[in-house]
Amino acid sequence: ECVTQLLKDTCFEGGDITTVFTPSAKYCQVVCTYHPRCLLFTFTAESPSEDPTRWFTCVLKDSVTETLPRVNRTAAISGYSFKQCSHQISACNKDIYVDLDMKGINYNSSVAKSAQECQERCTDDVHCHFFTYATRQFPSLEHRNICLLKHTQTGTPTRITKLDKVVSGFSLKSCALSNLACIRDIFPNTVFADSNIDSVMAPDAFVCGRICTHHPGCLFFTFFSQEWPKESQRNLCLLKTSESGLPSTRIKKSKALSGFSLQSCRHSIPVFCHSSFYHDTDFLGEELDIVAAKSHEACQKLCTNAVRCQFFTYTPAQASCNEGKGKCYLKLSSNGSPTKILHGRGGISGYTLRLCKMDNECTTKIKPRIVGGTASVRGEWPWQVTLHTTSPTQRHLCGGSIIGNQWILTAAHCFYGVESPKILRVYSGILNQSEIKEDTSFFGVQEIIIHDQYKMAESGYDIALLKLETTVNYTDSQRPICLPSKGDRNVIYTDCWVTGWGYRKLRDKIQNTLQKAKIPLVTNEECQKRYRGHKITHKMICAGYREGGKDACKGDSGGPLSCKHNEVWHLVGITSWGEGCAQRERPGVYTNVVEYVDWILEKTQAV
């Protein structure tokens, strides 16, 4: 059962796993949620009745029954992890804590103009977990405006104390705000020879990389595959770090793979969700339960629904045995990974999908793309919406993209002459415009947020957000698309599609069925040559065929330029302006979404 509220002046008795320090009960709950075993916690707030050494302690707890006895205690705040909840979870914490000094290893000290600048520095520093900033009112003159970047083994402070005129906060890497590079490549036959901070067992290099990503100290990893010569090291995932943040030595070794933490791209690729099945593989660990199940998929479901289950092994039924049901072994361990991985025993293993809600919804795999043709099929572009105006009569106005459960990203130029959000309707999960009838459900628009630097599409800043009146329930036909990662600025996208109902302001010819066209990206330099009378800025991105032959009219204004990268779709552009459709096939010009990620997050995450 999901319990989100905090219990004031209440302490859970027993079940202690470990104690960490957090600046608030709210953050203690997040830490508990991300811990592999924590189900409950007790946080101690600052209070005259409490020993100051116990202030800000966050005791992480576990219980076989998923609950513990409650005891009254002043200043104690208790609660449950969000593991039991089905809603989306984020580790992003933008709070600034006034008069708190969060202790850790102070590895970098520099002058900063503000706490915000200090937080940005922390976010863009590969080692930084949190920071403390001495304000200009700080008593000691030589420490004023000093920004201390800190890290710890756990990613949380080793202690928190009260200190006047300082502020503290966390890195915003988990808010997708880091400018650090996102290196997704996995390097075969490579060992990174740097210090190991931890080691776990993993079935493949991808799982190893994901484990590295959500381990606070891991910057890169080396994985020894099941063919690794040294038997005791097979399936071993070594989590590594170095002072420089990069591997100091790369050794060529067959059957080893290495890669980097995906911290700077974690909002746009799955890092918690290990959804694959591993055939002829047994995961060892503490046994939680043994249940009969029809298939390995059913076994994974059982594991996902059992809150303490972390991974499983399914042994298929022997012929005609037990009504064709096999055995499903639900398992757990102290760190969420198998204690050992064995091959050749016929088992099928995998992980709980409960952790998938810690990943952005947009990373979920959608149904395979239909190759060829120009008409889309249902569910092919589940983030695509049709924005209608009801004034003077109802009609399709622009395309748009779902980027959050209350947010649509579109083009600013769509709202020329739109006086009020009341006349707008957003329809999602639509394939044919003819499906829209008077009784078709839609989302009302609460607010139109246009970039304040927008003047006209051709001058850039052609971006707008629509805040919906109600939230979108994600389904196969309506779900979000990932924003590109700032760390992905140098990625060369090769699988890009423009979609829409073919409507452009000047050519009022609208298609009934959602159209799609695969189009290559064009460099800004090349694009500038095609538009000599317009400035193609780095905040724009161009796409289209050099020699014509593709109908760029398929993209509506405001609709998406969607590019698939590493199996995840990213909203690379917003259809903005250009001379497609005419005989001369100039590239289409799109708003370059990666350049507006900060703006989008600032607007959508505002309290």
């Epitope: 000599r532 009378g533 317009h534 001379e579 100039r586």
Partner: antibody
């Protein structure tokens, strides 16, 4: 009907500057690019640059980049081309022209041309 | 910059003749080719755009063809008023460039 009317002929000394105007009428001035093209006596046509009257954005040919300035005055639908540090080989007829499309294209309407003579 | 090489640089033909001028681009210019007519002391006039589209009011004896890098301008039956210099121009990539011109005279 669409018309581009240019200012009259000019005689200038080497080192001086000249500013040629081009007044547009009969269409929405901000919606089409204005190009400038030079033609030396007995020679071919050479593109000098373009101005977007809507945004004021300019793009110049490398050969003229450091000496040419294109501006516009939207309220009077007029574009200007100023060429500085004149040399005798700048003696030419300068044309303004409107592009056929909003984003560029062939030049469908031309001014009558302005002869600039550079002589000491 | 894309070079447009026009040939011949001059030609003499009789009234009623079929006249052909060619233009070769140094790289592909898609369909972004136009042809202009310029009479002495006058501004150029647009005749053909997008390789083969006749501009408004241009007589049907003027036509254009070609693709990629090779383009042809044709006057199917030369008239006395066609005496002028003809220019090709590419508009595919900035800076737009013109051919050096073909001066057409009547024999």
């Amino acid at each position: 009907q669409v018309q581009l009317v240019q200012s009259g002929a000019e005689v200038k000394k080497p080192g001086a500057s000249v500013k040629v105007s081009c007044k547009a009428s009969g269409y929405a001035f901000s919606n089409y690019l204005i190009e400038w093209v030079g033609q030396a006596p007995g020679q071919g046509l050479e593109w000098m640059g373009v101005i977007n009257p809507g945004s004021g954005y300019t793009n110049y040919n490398e050969n003229f980049k450091d000496r040419v300035t294109m501006t516009r005055h939207t309220s009077i639908s007029t574009a200007y081309m100023e060429l500085s540090r004149l040399r005798s080989d700048d003696t030419a007829v300068y044309f303004c022209a409107r592009t056929y499309g909003k984003y560029g294209g062939a030049m469908d309407f031309w001014g009558q041309g302005t002869l600039v003579t550079v002589s000491s | 910059d894309i070079q447009m090489t026009q040939s011949p640089s001059s030609l003499s033909a009789s009234v009623g003749d079929r006249v052909t001028i060619t233009c070769k681009a140094s790289q592909s210019v898609s369909n972004d080719v136009a042809w202009y007519q310029q009479k002495p002391g006058k501004a150029p006039k647009l005749l053909i755009y997008y390789i083969s589209n006749r501009y408004t009011g241009v007589p049907s004896r003027f036509s254009g063809s070609g693709s990629g890098t090779d383009f042809t301008f044709t006057i199917s039956s030369l008239q006395p008023e066609d005496i002028a210099t003809y220019y090709c121009q590419q508009d595919y990539s900035s800076p737009p460039t013109f051919g050096q011109g073909t001066k057409l005279e009547i024999k």
